[in-house]
């Protein structure tokens, strides 16, 4: 059986939309599937790599690599999107390409970044972990770390940094899929909202879905002990 909830929820474009949340009800009247997984049920994607989920994550990453920061022209906010999802008239799509990106580092002025920009994250304004020396962030935003400390400045002068961020990674469903969404939408969908991250590639949704002990390698499920727990 399915339980359907409909509600007006604030979405990425800053407008309220009617959203449906469909929950698979437990046939035996008990915990939801998410809760059962958290309690240690035999759920194979938590035990070993699931090809379907792996493909989903790779597809999400490929899309994210090509994303940019969509900044609303009315200063109402910004969100990481694909160019096609960013209004040409009402917003500015900040995306580095060709020769428009910043240099990889102050020591290598010739090599430009082509992957980015990312809303609220920039190698030029992140103090921790700083992109310098032997630890220059790669020219692939899906390999960027979470910035734990921004440079202390109210304004940076960068469109994608000085905007009010409207969406962050949200882990939704037992498949461990990730979407950049508003907190409100994420909570309505019973997802896990990552306040600390800017990109889906920085979070490991399956690790969150599975719960219990974190995977040794967040990319590789290793909860073999589930076979005995349940």
């Amino acid at each position: 059986a399915q339980h359907v909830t409909t509600q007006l929820v604030l979405r990425n474009k800053g407008v309220y939309e009617s959203v449906k949340y469909i929950q698979q009800e437990n046939f035996w009247i008990g915990p939801s599937s998410i809760d059962l997984i958290h309690l240690g049920a035999k759920f194979s994607p938590c035990i070993r790599k699931d090809q379907q989920i792996e493909q989903l994550v790779l597809r999400e990453r490929d899309l994210e690599r090509d994303s940019g920061c969509c900044v609303q022209n009315d200063h109402s906010g910004c969100i990481q999107t694909q160019r096609k999802d960013c209004s040409e008239t009402l917003a500015t799509f900040v995306k580095w390409q060709d020769d428009t990106g910043p240099p990889m580092d102050k020591s290598d002025l010739g090599q430009k970044r082509t992957s980015g920009a990312v809303c609220h994250q920039d190698p030029r304004t992140c103090e921790e972990p700083a992109s310098s020396g032997a630890h220059i962030w790669p020219d692939d935003i899906t390999k960027w770390p979470i910035c734990t400390e921004q440079a202390k400045s109210n304004r940076t002068g960068f469109l994608h940094m000085d905007c009010q961020i409207k969406g962050r990674p949200c882990c939704i469903s037992t498949k461990g899929s990730c979407e950049i969404t508003t907190r409100e939408y994420c909570e309505f969908m019973h997802g896990y909202f990552h306040e600390e991250a800017t990109l889906c590639s920085q979070v490991h949704c399956l690790d969150k879905v599975c719960g219990l002990l974190p995977f040794l390698n967040p990319e590789v499920p290793d909860q073999f002990y589930r076979l005995w727990l349940s």
Partner: antibody, heavy 123, light 106 residues
Framework: QVTLKESGPGILQPSQTLSLTCSFS??????????VGWIRQPSGKGLEWLAH???????YYNSALKSRLTISKATSKNQVFLKIANVDTADTATYYC???????????????WGTGTTVTVSS | QVVLTQSPALMSASPGEKVTMTCSAG?????MYWYQQKPGSSPRVLIY???NLASGVPARFTGSGSGTSYSLTISRMEAEDAATYYC?????????FGAGTKLELK
Amino acid sequence: QVTLKESGPGILQPSQTLSLTCSFSGFSLSTFGMGVGWIRQPSGKGLEWLAHIWWDDEKYYNSALKSRLTISKATSKNQVFLKIANVDTADTATYYCARISNYGSNYWYFNVWGTGTTVTVSS
Amino acid sequence: QVVLTQSPALMSASPGEKVTMTCSAGSSVSYMYWYQQKPGSSPRVLIYDTSNLASGVPARFTGSGSGTSYSLTISRMEAEDAATYYCQQWNSYPLTFGAGTKLELK
């Protein structure tokens, strides 16, 4: 308000070492992304970049003069120093220090300049 | 090193006249920076990242260009614009400036 002020010996003889000080206020060189550079301008001529130093102590020099230049900083005193060894009459110029930042810029730029100090090398 | 050639070296314009000066790079650069220097004063930044107006700079100044060809335009010359203008690149070390364009008031 950001200000920079250069000071130097005014006059010195060939083969001596020129020591310049840039004292600044309104910003700190401990601030992430900040830098201070030195640029000189012989009278009636164009600008020549000499060197710059970053908040993280990385230093960059003009390769044509690198063997003679040394840049350093005293972060707590808000000062940057430039030494030019073995000066020659060709080093006679006005020396400027300038703040470097990348506020809103894909690269960096000299966004605030000092008033300059005139240095004459003469025997 | 990237050689920047500015032209003309000297020009004059009447108040209200449109002024355009160019900066040609010996090899391709991503962005150009423009500085204004009045006699007896230190330089000040006018344009950064080719076309962005620095804080406090009048809107009559515009920068444009790409690759090896860049220009600075003053839409309507004013007496206070009489100065020497320098272009500068931050694309590769050593950082280089053009020799300057001296703009005089007619």
